[in-house]
């Protein structure tokens, strides 16, 4: 036996479900149509932002091991030799994001050496 | 198909400025990265810098920061590339490059090529 | 930065006969994601590049199956299993672990 309380849930639930719906049928086709596609746009839109996000991360990552001036972690156990805080700069001229401190960093390490 | 169109060829001489541009379309612009990628005449490919359109985020080679400028207009879907001297050492095709859609960490269409000739 | 050094820098193949490439990177590709970030592509003459593997042995969409990448760490392979008229022009080997940076480019042409 389900327990009233439990029970007022359940009916606020579908009452809600039918008033969303207009519990016609033919709106609920069209209404769960459009909502799927809702969902798929918005799981592309998101799967954009994390593609977008992620490689922003990445380049943050070189940019954040430079300016700490530590050497660039290796990766995995591979033949990574040490490396010089010059060796690999990443300048960021996303401004709003730079504090004057790390400003001061970019403008030191970036004596980019010509290749 | 993703089509990433850029401006035509140009003849400069040295010291004057130059912007290039590369058009993005048939796809979600701002979803993007944008990169720009140099090839001398005769040579390999070397990476200048990237942009994310979406709030002009850019970061540089450090082998071409501070001799180019890389700017974006989302709401025209171009992405831009400037010089405000140029030298003789700058004649090359530069080529704009789109990130990878399902290969996050690489460039999956590119541009036709802008060819920039400086010459005095 | 991280240098790729790719061999031979030209080739000269027989239509239908095999063909391999080296690269060869300053620091392991192999990121902490577990993901190894070596690209392959192609430049044909008079046009942009064209991405052919990714992630070191993923052919990209569209690419036919005789082109193969193999390799880890800092050691890599583009293999042709059938060199054709149209597999023409330079390949170049990509990393993208620590910004981007490409090889020299491997000058293919036929015999």
């Known amino acids: 036996m389900i327990p009233a309380k439990d029970m007022a849930k359940v009916m606020i639930v579908m009452l809600a479900i039918c008033f969303l719906t207009k519990s016609d049928g033919k709106s609920v086709k069209k209404r769960s149509v459009s909502e799927i596609q809702l969902m798929h746009n918005l799981g592309k839109h998101l799967n954009s932002m994390e593609r977008v996000e992620w490689l922003r991360k990445k380049l943050q990552d070189v940019h954040n091991f430079v300016a700490l001036g530590a050497p660039l972690a290796p990766r995995d156990a591979g033949s990574q030799r040490p490396r010089k805080k010059e060796d690999n700069v990443l300048v960021e001229s996303h401004e709003k994001s730079l504090g004057e401190a790390d400003k001061a960093d970019v403008n030191v390490l970036t004596k980019a050496k010509s290749q | 198909e993703v089509q990433l169109v850029q401006s035509g060829a140009e003849v400069k001489k040295p010291g004057e400025s130059l912007k290039i541009s590369c058009k993005g379309s048939?796809?979600?612009?701002?979803?993007?990265?944008i990169g720009w990628v140099r090839q001398m005449p005769g040579k390999g490919l070397e990476w200048m810098g990237i942009?994310?359109?979406?709030?002009?985020?850019?970061r540089y080679s450090p082998s071409f920061q501070g001799q180019v400028t890389i700017s974006a207009d989302m709401s025209i879907s171009t992405a831009y590339l400037q010089w405000s001297s140029l030298k003789a050492s700058d004649t090359a095709m530069y080529y704009c490059?789109?990130?990878?859609?399902?290969?996050?960490?690489?460039?999956?269409?590119w541009g036709q090529g802008t060819l920039v000739t400086v010459s005095s | 930065d991280i240098v790729m050094t790719q061999t031979p820098l030209s080739l000269s193949v027989t239509p239908g006969q095999p063909a391999s490439i080296s690269c060869k990177s300053s620091?392991?590709?192999?990121?902490?994601?577990?993901?190894?970030?070596l690209y392959w592509y192609l430049q044909k003459p008079g046009q942009p590049p064209q991405l052919l593997i990714y992630?070191?042995?993923n052919r990209f969409s569209g690419v036919p199956d005789r082109f193969s990448g193999s390799g880890s760490g800092t050691d890599f392979t583009l293999k042709i299993s059938r060199v054709e008229a149209e597999d023409v022009g330079v390949y170049y080997c990509?990393?993208?672990?620590?910004?981007?940076?490409f090889g020299q480019g491997t000058k293919v042409e036929i015999k």
């Open positions: 942009i994310y359109p979406g709030d002009s985020d850019t």
């Open positions: 992630e070191v042995s």
């Open positions: 990509m990393q993208s672990i620590q910004l981007w940076t």
């Open positions: 048939r796809y979600i612009f701002t979803n993007y990265w």
């Open positions: 490059a789109r990130q990878g859609d399902y290969v996050w960490g690489s460039f999956d269409s």
């Open positions: 620091q392991s590709l192999l990121d902490s994601d577990g993901k190894t970030y």
